[in-house]
């Protein structure tokens, strides 16, 4: 009879937590040093040996007395039923074709976990089972009492199962969902008594593969690989994840310490190509992602260092820096950005091996700048380095513009009092800190006579008392470096305040639109002046310089207020730099209704009439141009008198209204009255917007016809 190679010494152990049967056996009859391929047929039965539920052929290479192992994971918790295992073997090797037949079966090895359970009346399995959502799970209860009816509940909902035997019932849960991090609750309880048992089924969210897997080097010595782990499993402590990096060209492997990054030491043997597999693994499954790249194409340089800004003048500065080497022959492309007032104003790219240098031109004097530099691999761009930034301030230069100068001329006791005003130079014009202003007075009648006044900043004007002569005034602004061009204004012996008719202008949301007639002679420009706070002694004089070809402008200001009258003067500037008054304009940015009513005097009271008169009052103080007056008259009469019409007052009372549409009119005769009659009157001005406030009516009674006898 041919030699039979049968499995012997079969042992079966269990792992309840994993619902696994572990088989161990060996083959004794092999010759020494003989190694054969064999196939083992394994049968697993449940409850009774005739009920075979699993058959599997397991192929492996066998040596004499080698311990062979095989595991089987049961869908049903092992505590739910008795399991039996047997096996047989056959040689499956070309070396010994004559041995290709099955050996005898081993005897059945029985695994009965139930027998080791305690004497409790009820058990529920599996305990602490961990599965992924969407899985199918089998649970069971084992009852020690035939009499008792057992009900099982999944999250409070009764489940229906199949009876395996009188003591065991099985429940098949399909496509289990993730409910919560503390797991899914399953309870079983008996109808009689207070027997109740529960288990937790831990359902994890599906373990996702890592996303955005990427590797880069900063120094060609270490690769830093990063990834975004898949979403959380949703359980507190059950599922630890491990991440492994494997590089196929070198055959090296490393277990990553962190869940989203890992460092890899670059081979000293100048390996250029890398083929990484990142494997994420938890108790339930493995996920892998791959990445193939050339090392030199994944260089993320370190930030430039030794960055300096040197040779800073008023308009130029030089930036120098060093870069960290990324190999012997590589060139870095560096990007320089110049910031002024928070915005990029210059951008430049420079190729660098070790030292970088860049001249920044066309800078503004006395200005704060920030320059920053970053670099990337010029040959194979991957990523820019971080920026390295330096702040610097350019040197001062002499002011570039003449101050904007204006004047106010008053005649006081035979002298000419000139108030000079100037606007501070803008940052761009000042080119540094203005320290003082020089005012030079040149008497045009005695040209050799010059007088210098030095006025410390931040003054914005000065007052000069001059004789009746003509003067030319030169104003310059000065900083630590030098002097600005001079602003020249002339004052003649004649104050030049000739009478000019005032014209009304209407303001809009945008401001006042002013226009004037072009001058026939030579003018070097025009000036529009106004007060931002009329009526205030300080007035806050404002002016606007305009070119010689300009005949209109819009004056706008946030200071303009509704109901305030603004007066504008338009001056022409002669070739001798003497201002002369051309036009006057007056108006409101927005008219309002009159703020008060005039005081009215009544006179000439007769049986048939009386006369009303009122004082003129300052038009300047009115919140709009008065266009006329409304006179309201109340009487017992049903009809309104000629010249008046019916009107309804705000208190719904009815009266008669006379409209006086001449604002200059200051008297009015109320006629056609009845003798011995009672009247009430009230006078209010109106503007384009409406009438003044409604005030108290004045009472009057006409005498009877005979009262004078």
């Amino acid at each position: 009879e041919p030699l039979s190679l049968a499995p012997e010494s079969l042992e079966v152990s269990i792992d309840s937590a994993r619902q696994c049967l572990h088989l161990k056996w060996s083959v004794h009859n092999l010759a020494y040093h003989q190694e054969l391929k064999m196939v083992f047929q394994i049968e697993i039965s449940r409850i009774k040996t005739s009920n075979v539920i699993w058959v599997e052929n397991y192929s492996t290479t066998v040596k004499r007395n080698q311990v062979l192992r095989w595991s089987w994971e049961s869908k049903l918790p092992l505590e739910c039923a008795k399991h039996s295992v047997r096996m047989r073997g056959a040689v499956d090797d070309a070396q010994v074709p004559e041995l290709r037949f099955w050996s005898n079966w081993t005897s059945w090895e029985e695994v009965d976990v139930q027998s080791s359970l305690g004497h409790d009346p009820l058990f529920v399995f599996p305990k602490d089972k961990l599965v992924e959502e969407g899985s199918n799970v089998t649970i069971c209860y084992v009852s020690r009492s035939h009499q008792n009816n057992i009900s099982c509940y999944l999250e409070g909902v009764r489940m229906h199962g199949e009876q395996l035997d009188p003591n065991v019932c099985v429940f098949h849960l399909k496509n289990v969902p993730f409910i919560r991090e503390t797991g899914t609750n399953i309870y079983c309880k008996a109808d009689q008594g207070d027997v109740i048992k529960g288990i937790v089924l831990f359902v994890s969210k599906v373990f996702e593969e890592p996303k955005d897997f990427s590797c880069e080097t900063r120094d060609l010595k270490t690769l830093n690989c990063t990834w975004a782990p898949g979403s959380d499993a949703g359980l507190l402590t059950q599922l630890s994840q491990s991440y492994t990096l494997f590089e196929s060209f070198s055959g090296k492997k490393t277990l990553c310490k962190y869940k989203s990054w890992c460092n890899w030491q670059v081979s000293p043997d100048s390996q250029e190509m890398y083929n990484f597999t990142l494997t994420a693994e938890n108790y339930l499954r493995k996920r892998s992602v791959h990445l193939l790249f050339n090392l030199t194409h994944r260089v993320h340089p370190m930030a430039p260092f030794n960055v300096f800004v040197k040779n800073v003048s008023a308009t130029n500065a030089t930036m120098t820096w060093k870069v960290h080497s990324i190999g012997n022959y590589s060139t870095l492309l560096c990007q320089i950005e110049l910031y002024g007032e928070g915005k990029v104003i210059q951008k430049q790219n420079v190729s660098v091996k070790v030292n970088g240098k860049h001249l920044m031109k066309k800078l503004e004097p006395s200005t704060e700048y920030a320059a920053q530099v970053r670099c990337a691999n010029a040959n194979h761009f991957w990523k820019w380095s971080e920026w390295t930034r330096r702040n610097f301030t350019t040197a001062e230069a002499a002011p570039s513009e003449a101050p904007d100068v204006w004047r106010n001329v008053k005649s006081v006791q035979g002298h000419c009092v000139v108030t000079l005003f100037w606007k501070p130079l803008s940052k761009l014009q000042a080119n540094g800190k203005i320290l003082f202003y020089n005012v030079v007075l040149e008497n045009l009648d005695r040209p050799s006579t010059l007088k210098l006044l030095s006025i410390p900043a931040p003054a914005n004007g000065t007052e000069l008392t001059l004789d009746r002569c003509s003067y030319q005034i030169h104003v310059t602004a000065n900083n630590s470096v030098g002097t600005s061009p001079a602003s020249v204004i002339a004052v003649s012996g004649d104050p030049g305040n000739k009478e000019v008719e005032e014209e009304r202008v209407k303001g809009t949301e945008d401001g006042f639109c002013l226009s004037w007639k072009p001058q026939p002679g030579d003018v070097t420009g025009y000036v529009v002046e106004w007060c931002e706070r009329p009526g205030d002694p300080l007035c806050d004089l404002q002016w606007k310089n305009l070119g010689p070809n300009t005949t209109s402008t819009v004056v706008s200001s946030d200071a303009f207020r509704p109901g305030v009258r603004y007066n504008f003067r338009i001056y022409g500037i002669s070739t001798e730099r003497i201002p002369y008054l051309l036009e006057k304009k007056t108006g409101y940015s927005q008219e309002l209704v009159p703020s008060d009513n005039p005081q009215v005097l009544m006179s000439n009271l007769t049986s048939y009439s009386f006369t009303l008169s009122w004082k003129d009052y300052a038009a300047e103080s009115q919140p709009g141009f008065v266009q006329g007056y409304s006179l309201y008259l109340k009487s017992k009469a049903a009809r309104c008198l000629p010249g008046s019409e019916k009107a309804v007052l705000s208190d719904d009372s009815i009266c008669c209204k006379y409209k006086i549409d001449n604002p200059k009119q200051k008297t009015f005769v109320v006629e056609n009255l009845q003798p011995a009659s009672f009247y009430e009157f009230f006078l209010t001005p109106y503007t384009s917007v409406g009438e003044g406030p409604q005030g108290a009516f004045t009472k009057v009674t006409t005498p009877d016809e005979y009262s004078h006898i």
Partner: antibody, heavy 117, light 107 residues
Framework: EVQLVESGGDLVKPAGSLTLSCLAS????????MAWVRQTPEKGLQWVAN????????YYLDSLKSRFTISRDNAKNTLYLQMNSLRDEDTAVYYC??????????WGQGTLVTVSS | DIVMTQTPLSLSVSPGETASISCKAS??????VAWFRQKPGQSPQRLIY???TRHTGVPDRFSGSGSGTDFTLRISRVEADDTGVYYC?????????FGQGTKVEIK
């Protein structure tokens, strides 16, 4: 009769240590999750820790994790709570509780732990 | 952490009436809620689990309802023995947390 009896409560100084025990009877101890819950007048009931059937998984209130250790000995039907670096705010009645899952169907009578200098 | 807020904090009921205690969770806890009663000088006893399942031996006068964030314990036909402090507990997420308790007294 199902019973849980706590012991080990005592007066202890701050930074001291204490071990609480809970002896279970009347049921198969290894078939149940077990827990410690404490109670103070200020904070009411506060879950401290849980342990699964065989002690392979433990769960803690985060703020106590570094100082408290829950363990069990199924052969002795006993649950333990080892408390280190005790603080004034750990003063409470400590209950041992049986859990079918995470809610507690049987509670012991409690043991008082007082932390004071 | 999930905060369990009970209302009212105290309740006085006459025998035979119905008492209602509300428990609001600061996040969705589906039905992982239990109710306990603690009588003076005693340890807590479980009444309800999984929001609405009565514990063995608990009279049907006690009923629990709700899911998500709003839960209610109702005690109908209140008896003198129902006095005590009632607590809700969530076990949907760690840390497991309890409500602050509702004191029920019988007039």
């Amino acid at each position: 009769e199902v019973q849980l009896v706590e012991s080990g409560g005592d007066l202890v100084k701050p930074a001291g240590s204490l071990t609480l025990s809970c002896l279970a009877s009347g049921f198969t101890f290894s078939d149940y999750y077990m827990a410690w819950v404490r109670q103070t007048p200020e904070k009411g009931l506060q879950w401290v820790a849980n342990i699964n059937y065989d002690g392979s998984s433990t769960y803690y209130l985060d703020s106590l994790k570094s100082r408290f250790t829950i363990s069990r000995d199924n052969a002795k039907n006993t649950l333990y709570l080892q408390m280190n670096s005790l603080r004034d705010e750990d003063t409470a009645v400590y209950y041992c509780a049986r859990g079918l899952t995470w809610d507690f169907d049987v509670w012991g009578q409690g043991t008082l732990v007082t932390v004071s200098s | 952490d999930i905060v369990m807020t009970q209302t009212p904090l105290s309740l006085s009921v006459s025998p035979g009436e119905t008492a209602s205690i509300s428990c609001k969770a600061s996040q969705d806890v589906d039905t992982a809620v239990a109710w306990f009663r603690q009588k003076p000088g005693q340890s807590p006893q479980r009444l309800i689990y999984l929001a609405s399942t009565r514990h063995t031996g608990v009279p049907d006068r006690f009923s629990g309802s709700g899911s998500g964030t709003d839960f209610t314990l109702r005690i109908s036909r209140v008896e003198a023995d129902d006095t005590g402090v009632y607590y809700c507990q969530q076990y949907s997420r760690f840390p497991l947390t309890f409500g602050q308790g509702t004191k029920v007294e019988i007039k």
